[in-house]
């Protein structure tokens, strides 16, 4: 190889070892029979050299640096050439560096030809290996503006006082043009301006200078976004840190066309604007930092540009002014995205403050709109607290657990509506009475309705899940000892049509000691499957539950247990089951940790099944599944 650099070229070539590899044999640059691992060629020099190995690209890299001085003479503006031409260089990973020094009063603009640039962050890389690294200067300090790949939206970067631009090309890349030009501009009076041009739907992730390290103190950086008029843009902050300010406040400023309050000033922790039509600017302004403990300011954000959806032009009113202790959250449902560009899905408050989720609280009327390609990507979760603080006032009081009709007017699916029912400890208990009798969901007889009620204890220290219940069964009521949460969970969009089947009344009743009592009136046509709470995890220690099973006069009930033995092993206490005839009060007691469960048995009258747990050994829990069937009486055995 021969590299000759003209004396006035201001170009220096450096060949040096790249990243250490585990290659068995090293490689050297050979210059007139001398071996070296570094070669520097300066302007006016001509050097002949070879490599001592067949694949020098596995060992060496080449840096070509051109210093451009705009301080002492005219600046060579226009398209930047790759010099020396890549065809004259050895096939090594190459980095072309242009170091432009200019006066503070002169703005320098880097213009990138199509495909434009895409900024990438720490730990990422470019698919084709072609990387642009751009730095600026503040006095003597170098500031990293960012590293970029091809195929993005960044079309121009304006700086002042100088630019250091590095273009990295892998050894196998055929590229022979720089892909950018330099122009002079008037002073920009800030660190830099990055222009990002969208021609259609898409997204861009951008970062503050020096990211992930700190943005320079008291500096200003601006991003200009060029957006087609028919599209909408939304900004979301992916990651940010605030420094410790002594004077002034760190902030972002938006210049939004048509806004009457330009510039709109936001804190970094605020929700950022969305649903913006047309071009806009975003500026990051630093502050004077505390000299002793400066901290760091940094920002990584995303701009998402997409078509406005039909729904985004509608305003929905959510009236929670008459509700108490209620919160409504609209959020993304958890799904794996496979498409490359996924349009954003935002819910907007007052059409401007858009975010991926939104929580509305009771006591106010809220106006919301959507900026989303497909509203099935969102769902709604509602929480409502119903509490009783004075047991004398609440006793026998009833509340309807019904989803308010207002919610059905919203274009997103309801996922969960949770009622937290809170009672004074050891004073009152609760009874749930459904509009339609309920079926307990079991593997043997799963619910196939569009919604279910999930009933669980709402006492933080207690892990007790009574089960999942849907309309169309035999459970007439569920009594629970203390605080519970009842969650109406929907499973299909058809819930809107089936909404009339929902309806549960909760009443506050005198306190009782059992954890739960289920009142069951079996249907003559089908088996009723019942199982102990906390199925698969075991009934909690020392917990007692009962089933009050009604047997009509003309029927006989058959009680069948799924297993021969419960498998429970008690560490302390005893686990037992009592089956009691309600008419005669005759009862049988079974030791669940010792005895076999009873064989199928017939009951001619209503009866109780009561199960009380011990403190089981780990892994040897108490789980019981049983069923009841009715058959007509053939002979009167009273």
């Amino acid at each position: 190889f021969e590299i000759a650099l003209p004396r006035e070229s201001n170009i220096t070539v450096l060949i040096k070892l790249g990243t250490p590899t585990l290659l068995a044999k090293p490689c050297y640059i050979v210059i007139s029979k001398r071996h070296t691992t570094m070669l520097s060629i300066k302007p006016g020099e001509r050097i002949l050299f070879t490599f001592s190995c067949q694949s020098p690209e596995n060992h060496f890299v080449i840096e070509i640096q051109k210093n451009i001085d705009c301080m002492s003479g005219p600046c060579p503006f226009g398209e930047v050439q790759l010099q020396p031409s890549t065809s004259l260089l050895p096939t090594l990973n190459r980095t072309f560096i242009w170091d432009v020094k200019a006066h503070k009063s002169i703005g320098l603009e880097l213009q990138f030809s199509i495909p434009r640039l895409r900024q990438f962050g720490p730990g990422e890389s470019c698919p084709d290996g072609v990387t642009y690294s751009i730095s600026g200067r503040i006095d003597a300090t170098v500031v990293r503006i960012g590293t970029f790949c091809s195929n993005g939206t960044v079309s121009r970067i304006k700086m002042q006082e100088g630019v250091k631009m590095a273009l990295h090309l892998p050894w196998f890349h055929p590229r022979n043009v720089s892909g950018f030009s330099i122009a002079n501009r008037s002073s920009i009076k800030r660190l830099c301006i990055i222009e990002s041009v969208f021609e259609g739907e898409g997204s861009a992730t951008l970062m503050s200078a020096n990211y992930p390290e700190g943005f320079p103190e008291d500096e200003l950086m601006t991003w200009q976004f060029v957006i087609p008029a028919h599209l909408r843009a939304s900004v979301s902050f992916l990651n940010f840190n605030l420094s410790n300010c002594e004077r002034k406040e760190e902030r972002v400023e938006y210049y939004i066309p048509g806004s009457t309050t330009n510039p709109e000033v936001f804190k970094l922790e605020d929700k950022q604007p969305g649903n913006m039509a047309g071009n806009f600017n975003l500026s990051l302004q630093g502050c004077d930092q505390d000299a002793q403990n400066p901290g760091i300011l940094r920002l990584q954000f995303q701009v998402l540009v997409q078509h406005p959806q039909n729904e985004s032009n509608k305003i929905y009113v959510v009236d929670l002014s008459n509700e108490r202790a209620t919160s409504l959250t609209i959020e993304p449902r958890p799904v794996k995205q496979s498409r490359k560009f996924v349009p954003g899905c935002f819910v907007c408050l007052e059409s401007r403050t858009c975010s991926t989720n939104l929580t509305l609280t009771s006591g106010s009327k809220h106006k919301i709109s959507f900026l989303c390609d497909n509203l099935t990507r969102l769902w709604m979760n509602v929480e409502k607290n119903i509490s009783c603080t004075d047991h004398r006032y609440c006793q026998r009081k009833s509340y309807s657990l019904q989803v308010p009709s207002d919610i059905f007017h919203l274009p997103v699916e309801l996922h969960d509506f949770s009622w937290k029912l809170l009672v004074p400890k050891d004073r009152l208990s609760l009874v749930l009475v459904p509009a339609q009798k309920l079926q307990q969901h079991t593997h043997e007889k799963p619910c196939n309705t569009s919604f279910s009620y999930l009933v669980a204890s709402a006492i933080p220290s207690q892990d007790l899940y009574f089960g999942s219940f849907c309309p169309g069964g035999s459970i007439e009521q569920i009594q629970v000892k203390q605080n519970i949460s009842v969650t109406l969970r929907t499973f299909a969009p058809s819930f809107r049509q089936e909404a009339s089947r929902q309806g549960l009344t909760v009443s506050f009743i005198p306190y009782f000691k059992e954890e739960g009592v289920f009142t069951v009136t079996p249907d003559t046509k089908s088996k009723v499957y019942l199982r102990t709470p906390n199925w698969d995890r075991g009934l909690p220690s020392l917990t007692s539950v009962s089933w009050n099973i009604s047997v009509p006069r003309d029927q006989v009930a058959c009680l069948t247990f799924f297993k021969e033995r419960t498998g429970v092993v008690c560490q302390t206490g005893r686990a037992f089951m009592i089956i009691q005839e309600q008419r005669t009060r005759a009862e049988e007691i079974f030791s669940l940790d010792e005895d076999a469960l009873p064989k199928p048995r017939f009951h001619h009258h209503s009866f109780w099944v009561n199960i009380s747990n011990c403190s089981p050994a780990s892994g040897k829990q108490l789980d019981l599944l049983f069923w009841v069937t009715l058959t007509p009486r053939t002979v009167d055995l009273t």
Partner: antibody, heavy 116, light 108 residues
Framework: EVQLVESGGGLVQPGGSLRLSCAAS????????MHWVRQAPGKGLEWVAS????????SYADSVKGRFTISADTSKNTAYLQMNSLRAEDTAVYYC?????????WGQGTLVTVSS | DIQMTQSPSSLSASVGDRVTITCRAS??????VAWYQQKPGKAPKLLIY???SLYSGVPSRFSGSRSGTDFTLTISSLQPEDFATYYC??????????FGQGTKVEIK
């Protein structure tokens, strides 16, 4: 695994001689440059000499030129430093190092004490 | 011979501090500068080669840079295991190798 083990250090009188050895394993010294670097007690590092076995090229610090000789036996994968006319100021820990990505592997060092 | 003038000769710093050590070459050595870390009683360890390339296995808090004949080693956030002596060295192929005088980084 690359390893360098120095030996041959010890106590010697001024004007005496010593031969230090550096046994390399995990790589072939034929392909690399081998270096000796020393460190006097409580002082900084001082490069002493280097050899490139593939070309036979040697280089010395001015302070040892004419008194020290660096050599290598590629069949034994070992580098040597022959030290003659030793002086009190040659007292130091002598390290052997491999040269490629600068001095990328070092031995644990051997102590040479020149004293009467 | 080329002189490598290293400064400061010692410095006190706390865990988490950003530490900068500089070396000035008496003439151009291109980017042929390395930085080493040495702990008492141990052999030096290579941190940086070719002025700014991080040697494999070295934590990314260490970085090197060059501006003409001035070379800088930066530790972005000092860790307890970083208290040691640091040396710069030029290894430009036309000249004998030379080290800087060393910088001792001590706990404040």
């Amino acid at each position: 695994e690359v390893q360098l083990v120095e030996s041959g250090g010890g106590l010697v009188q001024p004007g005496g001689s010593l031969r230090l050895s550096c046994a390399a394993s995990g790589f072939n010294i034929s392909y690399y440059s081998m270096h000796w670097v020393r460190q006097a007690p409580g002082k900084g590092l001082e490069w002493v000499a280097s050899i490139s076995p593939y070309s036979g090229y040697t280089s010395y610090a001015d302070s040892v030129k004419g008194r020290f000789t660096i050599s290598a036996d590629t069949s034994k994968n070992t580098a040597y430093l022959q030290m003659n006319s030793l002086r009190a100021e040659d007292t130091a820990v002598y390290y052997c190092a491999r040269g490629y990505y600068a001095l990328d592997y070092w031995g644990q060092g051997t102590l040479v004490t020149v004293s009467s | 011979d080329i002189q490598m003038t290293q400064s400061p000769s010692s410095l006190s710093a706390s865990v988490g501090d950003r530490v900068t050590i500089t070396c000035r070459a008496s003439q151009s050595v291109s980017s042929a500068v390395a930085w080493y870390q040495q702990k008492p009683g141990k052999a030096p360890k290579l941190l940086i080669y070719s002025a700014s390339s991080l040697y494999s296995g070295v934590p990314s808090r260490f970085s090197g840079s060059r501006s003409g004949t001035d070379f800088t080693l930066t530790i972005s956030s000092l860790q307890p295991e970083d208290f040691a002596t640091y040396y710069c060295q030029q290894y430009y192929y036309f000249y004998p190798f030379t080290f800087g005088q060393g910088t001792k980084v001590e706990i404040k």
